[in-house]
Every structure is written in structure tokens, then in C-alpha cells.
């Protein structure tokens, strides 16, 4: 399918006469009839097998025909055909005079013909125009012609149908010869096959549109060249899909058991030491001055209550400072400048002179402790009650309120049997008809071996400078009675200026 195009350019009829020689009145109002037919060695009348076309009146006598393709398509003249172009043709161009407005052949007198030309030859499909000029005795016609293919037809004979498309059935444009030219990213006979992302694995990947790489089951990655490990595999790899080969330091079916958390995560901060303590578990041992699970927080140095004898602690940028109450000195207010005359013992404690009055010791009533009896004893701080018993402070003593099924001073006895090892400190339990009995090891006594027999705190000779040592039987502690000229809890300092301490 194509179009034979004829472009009329100029017609010369200077004398304004018809083919018969008779002049036109008032001038030759000229129009053209064109007949296109199959090749004939001698062009003869007969059917215009390839088509026919007529023009309106284009001018009078001599005139140039302007290109009117943009204004309605009358010039060039179009002679479409819907068959394979044979490559040869015959063309008849007749110039006629139109006395009136009716240009139909039957409406014209037979002598209205001005001129007639007939040509034949071969003509290849192409964009280039062939220029021709035909002259007779009285007229001259200049024209050009060509054959081009209709839209979607290609090839030397306009016989190849090719319609560009970009859909499920193909993605291509047409080359001049009618062959398909695939759009970028498509391949195959009809350009239906997408070109996958460069490097996409041939077996493990595929695509449904260009530059894509979709992975087949068991594969992943930009190029589908990485296997997918077993679902849930945390710290493992695979060489084929669904494997889970554990990385070093990991164990378990899914390689999710962290056998070396410290190395993998370095959770401990500020120079703390990390210890693996089981699967995904660790313990940080903090350097002095730090706290928190990961030793991530600084420790306020006053938190450890370093100041003694009622001293108050103040945090400082470079550490802490103890503000000592009257009568005490030292880095931790640990040294006393008081004597019994200063009534240093609180809460009803009784004062005993030591070292000829240069020092003293407080004997505290039950429920109080400390060098000045300044601390209330909370006998429950050590959580003495066993088996979930509730500890209650009762004046100078404590008692345990036991959960059902338990008894004993510390709820340490499972009612009426020895199953819960009621005897403290390694005592041996004996079941009796009306209860049980504990046989205690050396150094312990009481119904449940809970009472520790007093030890001699002076046995280790803790006092210096020939001081006399006294044992405080209620607290198992010692008190040093200093000779004249010495002070200190162990009589270790000569009397004089308060000592300077290296710490």
C-alpha cells in the first residue's frame, strides 16, 4: 500500500488556445485530469488501473501551481494504491478548459481539451522527487512525481506491513525496510522478551520488564546470585538455598545463639571488662567510678557513703570531699578529737575513756551501732528470712513472718521435717516426734545453730604501741585503750598535730 504523488509546478499556454487551435474565451480556465495505470509499452486509453484524480481550476492560460499540501492536500496530487508497487507505471496528464463551474467529463464539450501527455517507465519507491517537463507545439507542463509507502508499509514495493507498538505483544519501531527495530531493553523476534539487568543470573533470575532482575525461589540479591539461607537464620550463611551454616561465635539451628556476645557487640563502656555469661548474655565489671549494666554511667563517689562519724559528703569535679562534724577529722572523718566530756555517744550510748581521756569508745544500746551509736540497726537489711518470709523490725530485735508451710525463727523450717535443711551453719537436723533438733558445729549454738559463739576479737593483737585490747562481746569487735601519747582507733598515731594521710 502506498501513494503515487504528482506535483504540478508550472503550465505554459501563452496563446491561450485549445488543442484544436481554437482560442478560449476569455482565457483557458485550466484544470487537470490524471490517470495512473499499469505499465504499457504504448500508452493507450482504457481503465486507469492504479487510480485517477482531477484538480479544480488551477489557473488561466499560463500559471505556476503553488504547493498546497498544507492547505488541503491538492498539490501534490495523491493517487493511493493498496497493492504491491510493481516498480513500473503509465501516466496520462490531461489539461482541460472549464467554460463553467461543472468539471465533470460529461458536462464538458469534447473540444475542451488543451493538451495531453503520456509517459511510462520504471519508478522505485523513495522520498526523492523525479522532475519532468513535457512540451507540445503550444503548451509546456513542468511537474515532478514519486511513490512513497503509506503509514505502516515499508520495503521496496511497500509490501511489508509494520506497525510500531509498545505493549504485551511487542516493543518495537519499524526500520525503512520494514524490519522490526526493538525498543531499548527488549529483544526477540517480535521484541517481546525483556533484557534483564546486566549481570542478572541466567538460571536464578528473570525479568518481566527491562533492567529488572527478579529472583527465583531460594535466591536473592541485585543479580539473584546470592542464596537465601534457612528462614530465621540469623548469623549464618549458605552456598545453596535454605542452608544455615553458622558464622564463628554463633550456634544453634538458626545460628542465633550468641556464643561470644562480648566480641560481637563490645557492650561494656569506659574500659570495663566484659565476660560472656551464656547465650546472648554478658557481664560488665566496671572500673572504679562507673556503674550501670554496661558501666556506661559515672558513679557519684558519694554514693558509697565514704564519710564516717556523721560526716556529710559533697561531690566535686575531681572526686568528693567529706565535711566532718565537730570533733572529727581525716579524709573520711575517721579520726576523733573528742573525749567523753564532749558527750559524743548518741542514742543513749555510754562513753568509756581511752588513753587517759585522749580517746573514747561508745557502748551502744541494742538497735544502734557505729563508733558514736549514730546508726540505727536495721536488722532486716541482710534479708534473714528464708522461704519468702517477711522481715519485721521489732525494737531491738527482728522477727520473720513466715509464709504458710514454713516455720522457725527465720522461716527456715519446712513444717515438721528436715527437708528444707533448717539447721543453720552446717548443723545436722534430726527428726523428732514433736519437731526436730539441730546438732551444731563448733562455734555455733541455738535451736537452729543460728547463734554464733563469740570470738576473741583481740586475738590478732590489733592495738599498737603497747595499748590494751578489750573485746566487745556484743559486737565481736575490739577497743584499744591507748597509753599516754598515742591516739587512734588502734593507738597508731602519736599525739600532736593531726596526721597527714597518704590517701
Amino acid at each position: 500500500s502506498g501513494v503515487f504523488q504528482l506535483q504540478l509546478q508550472e503550465f505554459i499556454n501563452e496563446r491561450g488556445v485549445l488543442a484544436s487551435g481554437r482560442p478560449c474565451e476569455p482565457g483557458c480556465r485550466t484544470f487537470f485530469r490524471v490517470c495512473l495505470k499499469h505499465f504499457q509499452a504504448v500508452v493507450s486509453p482504457g481503465p486507469c488501473t492504479f487510480g485517477t484524480v482531477s484538480t479544480p481550476v488551477l489557473g488561466t492560460n499560463s500559471f505556476a501551481v503553488r504547493d498546497d499540501s498544507s492547505g488541503g492536500g491538492r498539490n501534490p496530487l495523491q493517487l493511493p494504491f493498496n497493492f504491491t508497487w510493481p516498480g513500473t507505471f503509465s501516466l496520462i496528464i490531461e489539461a482541460w478548459h472549464a467554460p463553467g463551474d461543472d468539471l465533470r467529463p460529461e458536462a464538458l464539450p469534447p473540444d475542451a481539451l488543451i493538451s495531453k501527455i503520456a509517459i511510462q517507465g520504471s519508478l522505485a519507491v523513495g522520498q526523492n522527487w523525479l522532475l519532468d517537463e513535457q512540451t507540445s507545439t503550444l503548451t509546456r507542463l513542468r511537474y515532478s512525481y514519486r511513490v512513497i509507502c503509506s503509514d505502516n508499509y515499508y520495503g521496496d514495493n511497500c509490501s511489508r506491513l509494520c506497525k510500531k507498538r509498545n505493549d504485551h505483544f511487542g516493543h518495537y519501531v519499524c526500520q525503512p525496510d520494514g524490519n522490526l527495530s526493538c525498543l531499548p531493553g527488549w529483544t526477540g523476534e517480535y521484541c517481546q522478551q525483556p533484557i534483564c539487568l546486566s549481570g542478572c543470573h541466567e538460571q536464578n533470575g528473570y525479568c518481566s520488564k527491562p533492567a529488572e532482575c527478579l529472583c527465583r525461589p531460594g535466591w536473592q540479591g541485585r543479580l539473584c546470585n546470592e542464596c537465601i539461607p534457612h528462614n530465621g537464620c540469623r548469623h549464618g550463611t549458605c552456598s545453596t538455598p535454605w542452608q544455615c551454616t553458622c558464622d564463628e561465635g554463633w550456634g544453634g539451628l538458626f545460628c542465633d545463639q550468641d556464643l561470644n556476645y562480648c566480641t560481637h557487640h563490645s557492650p561494656c563502656k569506659n574500659g570495663a571488662t566484659c565476660s560472656n555469661s551464656g547465650q546472648r548474655s554478658y557481664t560488665c565489671t566496671c572500673r572504679p567510678g562507673y556503674t550501670g549494666v554496661d558501666c556506661e554511667l559515672e558513679l557519684s563517689e558519694c554514693d558509697s557513703n565514704p564519710c564516717r562519724n556523721g560526716g556529710s559528703c559533697k561531690d566535686q569535679e575531681d572526686g568528693y570531699h567529706c565535711l566532718c562534724p565537730p570533733g572529727y577529722y581525716g579524709l573520711h572523718c575517721e579520726h576523733s578529737t573528742l573525749s567523753c566530756a564532749d558527750s559524743p555517744c548518741f542514742n543513749g550510748g555510754s562513753c568509756r575513756e581511752r588513753n587517759q581521756g585522749a580517746n573514747y569508745a561508745c557502748e551502744c544500746p541494742p538497735n544502734f551501732t557505729g563508733s558514736n551509736c549514730e546508726k540505727k540497726v536495721d536488722r532486716c537489711t541482710s534479708n534473714p528470712c528464708a522461704n519468702g518470709g517477711q522481715c519485721l523490725n521489732r525494737g531491738p530485735s527482728r522477727m520473720c513472718r513466715c509464709r504458710p508451710g514454713f516455720t522457725g525463727t527465720y522461716c527456715e523450717l519446712h513444717v515438721s521435717d528436715c527437708a528444707r535443711n533448717p539447721c543453720a551453719h552446717g548443723g545436722t537436723c534430726h527428726d523428732l516426734e514433736n519437731g526436730l533438733m539441730c546438732t551444731c558445729p563448733a562455734g555455733f549454738s541455738g535451736r537452729r545453730c543460728e547463734v554464733r559463739t563469740s570470738i576473741d576479737a583481740c586475738a590478732s593483737s590489733p592495738c599498737f604501741n603497747r595499748a590494751t585490747c578489750y573485746t566487745d562481746l556484743s559486737t565481736d569487735t575490739f577497743v584499744c585503750n591507748c597509753p599516754y601519747g598515742f591516739v587512734g582507733s588502734r593507738c597508731e598515731f602519736p599525739v600532736g598535730l593531726p596526721p597527714s594521710f597518704p590517701w
Partner: antibody
Amino acid sequence: QITLKESGPGLVKPSQTLSLTCTVSDGSINSGGSYWSWIRQHPGKGLEWIGYIKYSGGVHYNPSLKSRITISVDTSKNHFSLKMTSVTAADTAVYFCARAPGSHTFDIWGQGTMVTVSS
Amino acid sequence: DIVMTQSPGTLSLSPGERATLSCRASQSVSNNYLAWYQQKPGQAPRLLIYGTSNRVSGIPDRFSGSGSGTDFTLTISRLEPEDFELYYCQQYSRSPITFGQGTRLEIK
């Protein structure tokens, strides 16, 4: 985006135990670096840090509350909890759970739950 | 404990003005471990600044933090109507973690 939500009774009697739970959604409580924390705000007052727990169960508490509180974690349920014993009216506050992702800056908070201690 | 003191308690300014909120620590805050939060009524606080001067993703650049040692500042360069809320500072260098008592920013 990970979200936190507190749940528990809004009214607790004095001397009883306050129990709250913080549920973690759209994320795992197992993320190793995170500190899962409790913070409270007394009515019309400032914020007070209570303590934190890590996925491994390691805890650190505010010394002022240490004797009364226990924080625990249940990784299987993706939540952590606060228990506070012997409550008094002074424990009436909005209790928030929050996440600190590696240092103790709290980038994600629950909406908060008001707990009133009253008989 | 490190005590954090914020001043002023209330700051009255107009939209478009510059706000300067102060936070002072009773002891030096090491590593510049100081954060700022904004709290709207009935809501949880929202982290604005950490490490003294690092702005959290999504926080407008009109918010900035500065300071070191014991003195820290939150600056809002040009106040918008939504900025008039309660602001807290927090130190996280030393245990226990502590917050300031807050500064309320109100419209003049």
C-alpha cells in the same frame, strides 16, 4: 517506627504494689544496645528517672527508689515491666516507658499512664 | 546526684523573637552528655537535642544547643506559635540520670 504503650491499674492502694507493663510494637526488645527505661512525672512537676533494663535482664535503678522497685523483661512477649512496692501518695504520677538507643537519651516514649495511690 | 537547675522558670516572648533557655548542673557533665526535650500538655516529652548540640532528625533548624561543663543553653532562633511549650534538660553522664525542673515558654 517502633512504638511503646504502658498498661496497668490506674489506682493502687497505699502500701500495696504498683505493677505496670510496657509493650513494644513494630520492633524487637532484643535489640542489644537499647536501654528500656521507666520515667515518672509527678502532677505538675518535672521528670524522675526510675531505672532501666536491657534485653539480657541486666538492670540499673535510681538509688533513691532502688529498695522498692523491680524491672523485668519478657522477650517472648516483647514487653518489660515495673513493680514498685510499699507505695504511698508520693508515688502518684504519670509513668512513662521509654527507649534509650545506646546512650540515655530517650528517643521513643510511651503515651504515659496515670497512677493514683489512694485508699 | 547531679542537680539540674533551669532558668528562668517561665519565659514570656512573642512569635518571631529569639528564646534562650539556660540549664546549669551542680557538677560538670562529662562528654557533653546533655539533652533537651519539649513537652506538650498531656503528651510525652519529645527529644530535641542530644550530646549538647546535636539536633534530632526532623527537628527544625531553629532549635540549637550549646555549652559545656556545667552551663548549657537551648536557643530557638525565631519562635513559631507551636514552640510555646515546656522544655526540660537532662544529664546522662552520671547515675542517677537527672532532669531539670523545666522552663515554660509562654506567649507574651
